[in-house]
């Protein structure tokens, strides 16, 4: 059951497995949330009555029965972990906690103009987790201005205590906010000899990857596969750092392989849904349950639904023996990973998916495109919508697509003349423009949020958001689409598609089917040649056919030019202009999405 | 209809500059282009550079980078060539034209060109 | 930049002969080409642009053909009143360049 209040003065006892400090019950609760086996909690406020050694702890407990008695006790806030619930979770904090001073190893000390400034230097500091800020008004004058960056083992505070004039936060790099290099490269026969700050096993090197990512002083990782010659070490994941944050030594070894934590690609790929299945493997841990089960995937769905439960291990049945079922064996460890990986006995073996909630929605694989053809099919773009106006009269009036259960990203240029949000309709899930009758659900808009600088589509910050009056139900044929992560600049795209109902050539009609088209990227400065009246600015991105023929046309404005990387969509580019409908072979020009990142997170996060 | 007056003739001695306006008539004037474009005595026709009147942007050929300086006035549709430093190398007729597209292309009107004579 | 080559530089031709004047550009520069007429102390008039399209009042004795790299433009009945200077010019990649004209002359 999903219980997201918190109790006030009511404290848990019992169950206890760990004590942290954290600077609020609120990100107590997202801390238990992201522990391995914490479901209950209860945190201590700042409290005459309370010892102030007490302040700030919060106490992550375990039950197995899921609760614990509850005891009345002042300064005492307790609550349940967001493990039992089906809605989306995010470690993202962006609070600034005033007069408080959270304690870590200080590594920086730097002079900063604001707690802002403090702030994104910790997030683009590969080392820090939080920071400490002294304002103007500290007493001690050389200490003032100054911006502590601080880590720890945990990534929460060693100890919180109250200090005048001081304010404290987080990095935000689990808010998609780091300018940091998302390096996802895998390297093949590849240790990388540096201190171990941890080791965990792991099927293989995408899961170990995965672990470094949502460790907090993991940096980068290397993963001794089942063929590793030294049978102990076989599937271990050492989780690693260094203090330049790089490792400063690669050996070349076979059967072993490492990469780089994902901290700052995390929003566009999965870091916390292990999804696959390991056939002819077992996973060892203490046992939490034997249940009967049908398939592997059915034992997977079991081990989702207990919240207790971090893997499983399905033994298939032998034949004609119980109905055709197998056995399900749900397992837990205290880190969440198995603590033995075993080969050769026939089992399957994967993941709980409930870790999958904590992972963006746009992560999640959509099902196979169809190659080749104009038209689209049902769920292949399910973040793609129709916009229509309805006036004078109801029609389509530009693309756009989902980027979250309320906002829709699409390109400014798109409201010339549209007076209010009151005549806008979204309609999701859509392939035919003739679906579209007069009882269709639609979502209303409730506001219009273009790009204060936007003037013209040729001159940049053509971008908008809708902010919809109802939430979308994600399914199917109508989920997000991942933005690109700040960190993702330098990829390189080489699977893009833009997609609309727009004219397929000047003076053609709005299409009835989605139309989709493959499109290579163009650099800026080939695109700048092609457009020599025109500024093409960095926050622009160009796509199209040398030989034309290709491109988005009139009435595709403000949809997606979407690209497949790494398995996952990202929206690369909001169609914005361009010559018109390939008939001079000129690449279309985009808004480049990834450069406003930080404006759409700002848009969307706002209270 | 679509017209583009230039201004006279010029006589100028080097190491001056000079002024070549370009008045557009018939047409929205921010919506298209304008192109400079020069003819040497007996010579061909080089491209000088491009403004955008909509949003005052300019691009110019390297060969003219530190020679020529465009700019639009959009209330009075007028666009202007200052050219600087001149010599007697820059003696040419000069073109004014306007694009066939919105986003370059040929250019379907010129002006009637105007005689810059550099002298001492 | 591109280099539009030209050729020839001169035609001698009879009222009636059919002329072709040719241009290689040097790297592909898809349909984006146009040509151009300039007759004697006059500016230049638009002929043909992207390759084939004749200009609104284009007399249809005026073609152009090609594509990439290889482009003619065609006088198919040549009159008196055609005696002028022919440019090409790519338009596909800034700077625009021209070629360096073909001058056309009534024996």
């Known amino acids: 059951e999903c219980v997201t209040q918190l109790l006030k003065d009511t404290c848990f006892e019992g169950g206890d497995i760990t004590t942290v400090f954290t600077p609020s019950a609120k990100y107590c609760q997202v801390v238990c949330t992201y522990h391995p086996r914490c479901l209950l909690f209860t945190f201590t406020a700042e409290s005459p009555s309370e010892d102030p050694t007490r302040w700030f702890t919060c106490v992550l407990k375990d039950s197995v029965t899921e609760t614990l008695p509850r005891v009345n006790r002042t300064a005492a806030i307790s609550g349940y972990s967001f493990k039992q619930c089906s809605h989306q979770i995010s470690a993202c904090n962006k609070d600034i906690y005033v007069d408080l001073d959270m304690k870590g190893i200080n590594y920086n000390s730097s002079v900063a103009k604001s707690a802002q400034e403090c702030q994104e230097r910790c997030t683009d500091d590969v080392h820090c987790h939080f920071f400490t800020y002294a304002t103007r008004q500290f007493p001690s004058l050389e200490h003032r201005n100054i911006c502590l960056l601080k880590h720890t083992q945990t990534g929460t505070p060693t100890r919180i205590t109250k200090l005048d004039k001081v304010v404290s936060g987080f990095s935000l790099k689990s808010c998609a906010l780091s300018n940091l290099a998302c390096i996802r490269d895998i390297f093949p026969n590849t240790v990388f000899a540096d201190s171990n700050i941890d080791s965990v096993m792991a099927p293989d090197a995408f899961v170990c990857g995965r672990i470094c990512t949502h460790h907090p002083g993991c940096l980068f990782f290397t993963f001794f596969s089942q063929e590793w010659p030294k049978e102990s070490q076989r599937n271990l994941c050492l989780l690693k750092t260094s203090e330049s944050g790089l490792p400063s030594t690669r050996i070349k070894k076979s059967k072993a392989l490492s990469g780089f934590s994902l901290q700052s690609c995390r929003h566009s790929i999965p870091v916390f849904c292990h999804s696959s299945f390991y056939h002819d493997t077992d996973f060892l841990g203490e046992e939490l349950d034997i249940v009967a089960a049908k398939s592997h995937e059915a034992c997977q769905k079991l081990c989702t639904n207990a919240v207790r439960c971090q893997f499983f291990t399905y033994t298939p049945a032998q034949a004609s023996c119980n109905e055709g079922k197998g056995k399900c064996y749900l397992k837990l460890s205290s880190n969440g990973s198995p603590t033995k990986i075993l080969h050769g006995r026939g089992g399957i073996s994967g993941y709980t998916l409930r870790l999958c909630k904590m992972d963006n929605e746009c992560t999640t694989k959509i099902k196979p495109r169809i190659v080749g053809g104009t038209a689209s099919v049902r769920g292949e773009w399910p973040w793609q919508v129709t916009l229509h106006t309805t006036s004078p009269t109801q029609r389509h009036l530009c693309g756009g697509s989902i980027i979250g259960n309320q906002w829709i990203l699409t390109a400014a240029h798109c409201f010339y003349g549209v007076e209010s949000p009151k005549i806008l309709r979204v309609y999701s899930g859509i392939l035919n423009q003739s679906e579209i009758k007069e009882d269709t659900s639609f979502f209303g808009v409730q506001e219009i949020i273009i790009h204060d600088q936007y003037k013209m589509a040729e001159s940049g910050y053509d971008i908008a958001l809708l902010k919809l009056e109802t939430t979308v139900n994600y399914t199917d044929s109508q989920r997000p689409i991942c933005l690109p992560s700040k960190g993702d600049r330098n990829v390189i795209y080489t699977d893009c598609w833009v997609t609309g109902w727009g004219y397929r050539k000047l003076r053609d009609k709005i299409q009835n089917t989605l139309q989709k088209a493959k499109i290579p990227l163009v650099t800026n400065e080939e695109c700048q040649k092609r457009y020599r009246g025109h500024k093409i600015t960095h926050k622009m991105i160009c796509a199209g056919y040398r030989e034309g023929g290709k491109d988005a046309c009139k009435g595709d404005s403000g949809g997606p030019l979407s690209c497949k990387h790494n398995e996952v969509w990202h929206l690369v580019g909001i169609t914005s202009w361009g010559e018109g409908c390939a008939q001079r072979e000129r690449p279309g020009v985009y808004t480049n999405v990834v450069e406003y990142v930080d404006w759409i997170l700002e848009k969307t996060q706002a209270v | 209809q679509v017209q583009l007056q230039q201004s006279g003739a010029e006589l100028v001695r080097p190491g001056t500059s000079v002024t070549v306006s370009c008045k557009a008539s018939g047409y929205a004037f921010s919506n298209y282009l304008i192109e400079w474009v020069n003819q040497r005595p007996g010579q061909g026709l080089e491209w000088i550079g491009v403004i955008n009147p909509g949003s005052g942007y300019t691009n110019y050929n390297e060969n003219f980078k530190d020679k020529a300086t465009l700019t639009a006035d959009t209330s009075s549709s007028t666009a202007y060539m200052q050219l600087s430093s001149l010599t007697s190398d820059d003696s040419a007729v000069y073109f004014c034209?306007?694009?066939?597209?919105?986003?370059?292309?040929?250019?379907?009107?010129w002006g009637q060109g105007t005689s810059v004579t550099v002298s001492s | 930049d591109i280099v539009m080559t030209q050729t020839p530089k001169f035609l001698l031709v009879s009222a009636g002969d059919r002329v072709t004047i040719t241009c290689k550009a040097s790297q592909s520069v898809s349909n984006d080409v146009a040509w151009y007429q300039q007759k004697p102390g006059q500016s230049p008039k638009l002929l043909i642009y992207?390759?084939?399209n004749r200009y609104t009042g284009v007399p249809d004795r005026f073609t152009g053909s090609g594509y990439g790299t290889d482009f003619t433009f065609t006088i198919n009945t040549v009159q008196a009143e055609d005696l002028a200077v022919y440019f090409c010019?790519?338009?596909?990649?800034?700077?625009?360049?021209f070629g360096g004209g073909t001058k056309l002359e009534i024996k």
């Open positions: 992207y390759i084939s």
């Open positions: 034209a306007r694009t066939y597209g919105k986003y370059g292309g040929a250019m379907d009107f």
């Open positions: 010019q790519q338009d596909y990649s800034s700077p625009p360049t």
